[in-house]
Interface confidence: low
Amino acid sequence: NAGVTQTPKFQVLKTGQSMTLQCAQDMNHEYMSWYRQDPGMGLRLIHYSVGAGITDQGEVPNGYNVSRSTTEDFPLRLLSAAPSQTSVYFCASSY
């Protein structure tokens, strides 16, 4: 098993650009989530999903969209990149 695969590793965007961060897991996990970590702060939940077709907002969903069409994939889309979205992003999955 590859576990959780997140791409790209690095990305530079101009303000206003949109992009998608891909996240896939091959462990048949139902729960998947996206977090952001800013300097000096802990992980903050952006969006999460408890199963295919089900998504919900976390603490900081502003400016992001997610979809969960399959159990394996949980892409995070930055709708219109802003300086405030400069961060390190983590995807996670669990049973």
């Epitope: 502003n62 802003a82 405030s84």
Partner: antibody, heavy 119, light 107 residues
Framework: QVQLVQSGAEVKKPGSSVKVSCKAS????????IHWVRQAPGQGLEWMGE????????KYNEKFKGRVTITADTSTSTAYMELSSLRSEDTAVYYC????????????WGQGTTVTVSS | DIQMTQSPSFLSASVGDRVTITCKAS??????VVWHQQKPGKAPKALIY???HRYSGVPSRFSGSGSGTEFTLTISSLQPEDFATYFC?????????FGQGTKLEIK
Amino acid sequence: QVQLVQSGAEVKKPGSSVKVSCKASGYSFTTYYIHWVRQAPGQGLEWMGEFFPGSGNIKYNEKFKGRVTITADTSTSTAYMELSSLRSEDTAVYYCAGSYYSYDVLDYWGQGTTVTVSS
Amino acid sequence: DIQMTQSPSFLSASVGDRVTITCKASQNVGINVVWHQQKPGKAPKALIYSSSHRYSGVPSRFSGSGSGTEFTLTISSLQPEDFATYFCQQFKSYPLTFGQGTKLEIK
């Protein structure tokens, strides 16, 4: 720091319209949502609608649909809320509020604009 | 629409008291609840978001908890500046809705 400064008090006649402005500063105007909420005298808070300047997306409370129009001028970082066909029960303090942490969490509030509808 | 019902509507307490305000949602809203404080003649101020997360600058005596349909705001030791009206707000679905408010008065 984030500031939302609203236009001054208005007195309007029944049947007329009012347009309230909300000028934002201290953050990137196109990045965060602007909401409009009203509070009638001695009453609770009532959400009217929201606007995302970054995309132009608008959502209205069905209760106000057809009577409320939310717009913005990104060049001046100003949002507007226009309410038409005013009646006495529209007498209230109207607030704009900005969402930073989440689409629909009202983090920052303007000082409020009192609108009085009276013949 | 999701109804948010707060209790009590009025609460008399003394400086130093521990007080708890409850908010019940008419349907499951997850943790998508915010607590606001409003002083007379002033705009509301957000205190707690996502049920239990304090905003920067909000004193630690304020805490929130709950998920699903029942939420609480607790002030561990009332200070004179805490006497105000408190509103809960759900952001699970549109239209966004608020509780009717709890007015916290000095006993």
